[in-house]
């Protein structure tokens, strides 16, 4: 709390300008009118205030707007945003995408902070859903944003927004998140032709069920190994050797290098060795010829 002291003669600020950098904390408190500061917030970011000086300016705005800042002030906070707490931000009502962009610009290159997370949460809740423009903006600043959301939060993403998602935005998503996103992507891209569809859907395939993988295997898609390794194990296991061969095309040779890793390892254990031998890759570990294959999935589920 800054002590209340009278402003020295001739030091009363007529406008927000660079002369204020020479003011001590108590002089800023005494000589800068909060209403003047609010109307000239756009000038603050051009002035090299220290964090301590920014604390004083924030204190003045807090006194002027105890219920939360208006959007006209929020849009021009600049580096002052770095001094806001999540509690401050929860009082705001940010509706303009331009305001969101301005504040994310200040945080460009920073790790996702509690302040930014709160700002985004307030903005998205205010909009009711994660629309395409918002998602475009957020993933441009934070490529990992989508994967930071819970499956429940992702369920509010409309399929139309999926067009804004880039492959790198899904890099850190786990299977539970892809389970939610995949059906939306399938819906969003449903009117595209085969090869174009595969290019778009590829990043989301970690959420694809077996039947969709079987369908893709009939379309000469030549899935790369990196994509195959991200598929759900339970979706890969029922695929036949012939289906995997068609799905991977020329990339099928890569299975040998991945034979000890999931899902390839588990898939090999489910295939007849005779069938694996037809690939000519030397894959070992399949079911020997003459053995009876029982489906234990029901038994596993019960135990």
């Amino acid at each position: 709390e800054v002590e209340k002291t009278a402003c020295p003669s001739g030091k009363k600020a007529r406008e927000i300008d660079e002369s204020l950098i020479f003011y001590k904390k108590w002089e800023l408190e005494a000589c800068v009118d909060a209403a003047l500061l609010a109307t000239q917030m756009d000038r603050v970011n051009a002035i090299p205030f220290t964090y301590e000086q920014l604390d004083v300016l924030k204190h003045k705005l807090d006194e002027l707007y105890p219920q939360g800042y208006p959007e006209s002030v929020i849009q021009h906070l600049g580096y002052l945003f770095l001094k806001m707490s999540p509690e401050d931000i929860r009082k705001w009502n940010v509706t303009s995408l331009e305001t969101l962009k301005a504040l994310l610009e200040v945080n460009k290159g920073h790790e996702m902070s509690p302040q930014v997370a709160t700002l985004i949460d307030r903005f998205v809740k205010g909009r009711g859903q994660l629309d395409k423009d918002t998602l475009d903006t957020l993933t441009a600043f934070y490529p990992g944003y989508l994967c930071s959301l819970s499956p429940e939060e992702l369920s509010s993403v409309p399929p139309s927004s999926i067009w804004a998602v880039r492959p790198q935005d899904l890099d850190t998503c786990d299977p539970r998140q892809l389970d939610v996103l995949y059906p939306k992507a399938r819906l969003a891209f449903q009117n595209m032709n085969g090869s174009e569809y595969f290019v778009k859907i590829q990043s989301f395939l970690g959420g694809a069920p077996t039947e969709d993988l079987k369908a893709l295997s009939q379309q000469n898609v030549s899935m790369d190994l990196a994509t195959f390794m991200k598929l759900r194990t339970d979706a890969v296991l029922p695929l036949t050797v012939a289906e995997v061969q068609k799905l991977l095309g020329p990339h099928v040779e890569g299975l040998k290098a991945e034979e000890r890793h999931r899902p390839v390892r588990d898939w090999i254990l489910r295939q007849r060795q005779d069938d694996l031998d037809t690939l000519g890759l030397g894959l070992q570990g399949g079911i020997p010829n003459g053995y009876l294959v029982l489906d234990l999935s029901m038994q596993e589920a019960l135990s």
């Epitope: 950098i21 090299p48 220290t50 964090y51 770095l82 945080n107 509690p114």
Partner: antibody, heavy 117, light 107 residues
Framework: QVQLVESGGGLVKPGGSLRLSCAAS????????MSWIRQAPGKCLEWFSY????????YYADSVKGRFTISRDNAKNSLYLQMNSLRAEDTAVYYC??????????WGQGTLVTVSS | DIQMTQSPSSVSASVGDRVTITCRAS??????LAWYQQKPGKAPKLLIS???RLQSGVPSRFSGSGSGTDFTLTISSLQPEDFAIYYC?????????FGCGTKVEIK
Amino acid sequence: QVQLVESGGGLVKPGGSLRLSCAASGFTFSDHYMSWIRQAPGKCLEWFSYISSSGGIIYYADSVKGRFTISRDNAKNSLYLQMNSLRAEDTAVYYCARDVGSHFDYWGQGTLVTVSS
Amino acid sequence: DIQMTQSPSSVSASVGDRVTITCRASQDISRWLAWYQQKPGKAPKLLISAASRLQSGVPSRFSGSGSGTDFTLTISSLQPEDFAIYYCQQAKSFPRTFGCGTKVEIK
């Protein structure tokens, strides 16, 4: 008076890890943002990370992103830098500095990190 | 990233000389500029912030000026303890960046 003392430097092999510490005294540590800056032999100064007073706001330059982690313990008046996957180009004197926003007003004496096989 | 270019890279001068060092930013940084002095084996020491604000305890022979992209550090009358490397640094945008220094040597 304000004092910043770095420690933890030394010789490490490429791919190795090191943890630097910076002990602060003479000011209210929990009120201040803190930064790490480094200077490779005969090279320019490079600011590469900072952390806010509460620890909630963090920045990494691209040169260290994903490899270095900045943290602080306000109860111990200490700033830390965990450095993983070290490379030869990380060889430098590492300084911690008090960050006041428009400049760095106090610096430590530095600690030398040498990455070599 | 904003590039900071200092010139000259080194200057030879005598005690009592007036020395001027310039720093140019690759884009407008308003007055978000600081100057530091570094002596061999020592940490940099802040001289000037906000382009022209002299840090407490720094002799008045040091002065800074400029705004936008062009900045100047002036030592009005060089003293023996002033022989060192001088760096400029911008704080207008992240990442903060430094100039590569100007070495002030004895003539």
